[in-house]
């Protein structure tokens, strides 16, 4: 039975040209994590495999950095990076857990303006 849960950063925003860390955390299970995939709706960004290490998709090699931990750092953000990102934890013996993050990349001035007027 799958008892684990994935905690993610949820909905996040970042500034165009900046960078962001995509992070998921698997809790409430003793299952062994053997691979983590980072995916967009239609393409793979990266895989971290316990035996093989990190694989970054050639399309993202210039602006994706592995880590911290099992997370992924996206750099030189553009408005086209807005959208859904998924972490898929492959575990033994539980199976697969999926987490979803929605990233909105904002024009610099909008991001700054939003930061000043955040609701506590």
């Amino acid at each position: 039975m799958m008892t684990g849960t994935i905690e993610t950063t949820g909905n996040i925003s970042a500034e165009k040209g900046g960078s962001i860390i995509l992070q998921c955390h698997l809790s409430s299970t003793t299952a062994q994590v053997t691979q983590v995939n980072w995916e967009q709706q239609d393409q793979l960004l990266a895989i971290c495999n316990a035996d093989l290490g990190w694989h970054i998709s050639p399309s993202f090699k210039d602006r994706v950095a592995p880590g911290p931990g099992l997370g992924l750092t996206l750099q030189s953000l553009t408005v086209n990076d807005t959208g859904e990102y998924f972490c898929i934890y492959h575990t033994y013996p539980d199976g697969t857990y999926t987490g979803r993050i929605f990233l909105e990349v904002l024009e610099s001035s909008v991001a700054e303006h939003g930061a000043r007027f955040q609701i506590p």
């Epitope: 995916e39 709706q41 239609d42 393409q43 793979l44 998709s57 979803r100």
Partner: antibody
């Protein structure tokens, strides 16, 4: 349990347009993270992915078929559709609808509907 | 597009034997390969994803391995009900593409 069921006309003439329906039960096609795909299998077994409609409504096609295919949906009826025009004998195949996961693998398939394009 | 090549169209085996099917990708797909089984008159069924992970309910005689461009699907002890065509699929990028299939025949 999730089930998919295709339906279509069976036989169409060359140059015509076909409209195939996939009826989904056991899950809403607006359930987060799933894609609802069309795949065809030619005589001789070759499988070709045609395209999908995402739970959010966005659509992606196989570039080789973009100009001839349209995928739509009817969310109240929990159905999605494939329309393909300018048919030729080379479009003769079994057409499957399938659920696609975040990993881009197909975990549930319909039983398939056979389309024959012949005059 | 990424081309998936299954070099053997047919493999003949006996009940209880071990059989391995290979699949080669035209470019590095890391571990993003799935395997499907299609029995006569049925639709394909997902067996393996991410090269080596068994899908829910799949018997443990079915295993997958490989990374990069070379992948192997193995049935450790073939049963009569394993008579089927087996396909690999890359789930690395769009468009999703399949191998041509390998038919496992029972002697």
């Amino acid at each position: 349990d999730v089930q998919l069921q295709e339906s279509g006309p069976g036989l169409v003439k060359p140059s015509q347009t076909v409209f195939l329906t996939c009826t989904v039960t056991g899950i809403s096609i607006t359930t987060g993270n799933y894609k609802w795909s069309w795949i065809r299998q030619f005589p001789g077994n070759k499988l070709e992915w045609i395209g999908y409609i995402y739970y959010s409504g966005t659509i992606t096609y196989n570039p080789s078929l973009t100009s001839r295919t349209t995928i739509t949906r009817d969310t109240p009826k929990n159905q999605f559709f494939l329309e393909m025009n300018s048919l030729t004998a080379e479009d003769t195949a079994t057409y499957y609808c399938a659920r696609e996961t975040v990993l881009r693998v197909f975990d549930y398939w319909g039983q398939g509907t056979t389309l024959t394009v012949s005059s | 597009d990424i081309v998936m090549t299954q070099s053997h169209k047919f493999m003949s085996t006996s009940v209880g034997d071990r059989v391995s099917i290979t699949c080669k990708a035209s470019q590095d797909v890391s571990t993003a390969v799935a395997w499907y089984q299609q029995k006569p008159g049925q639709s394909p069924k997902l067996l393996i994803y991410s090269a080596s992970y068994r899908y829910t309910g799949v018997p443990d005689r079915f295993t997958g391995s490989g990374s990069g461009t070379d992948f192997t699907f193995t049935i450790s002890s073939v049963q009569a009900e394993d008579l089927a065509v087996y396909y690999c699929q890359q789930h690395y990028s769009s468009p999703r593409t399949f191998g041509g299939g390998t038919k496992v025949e029972i002697k």
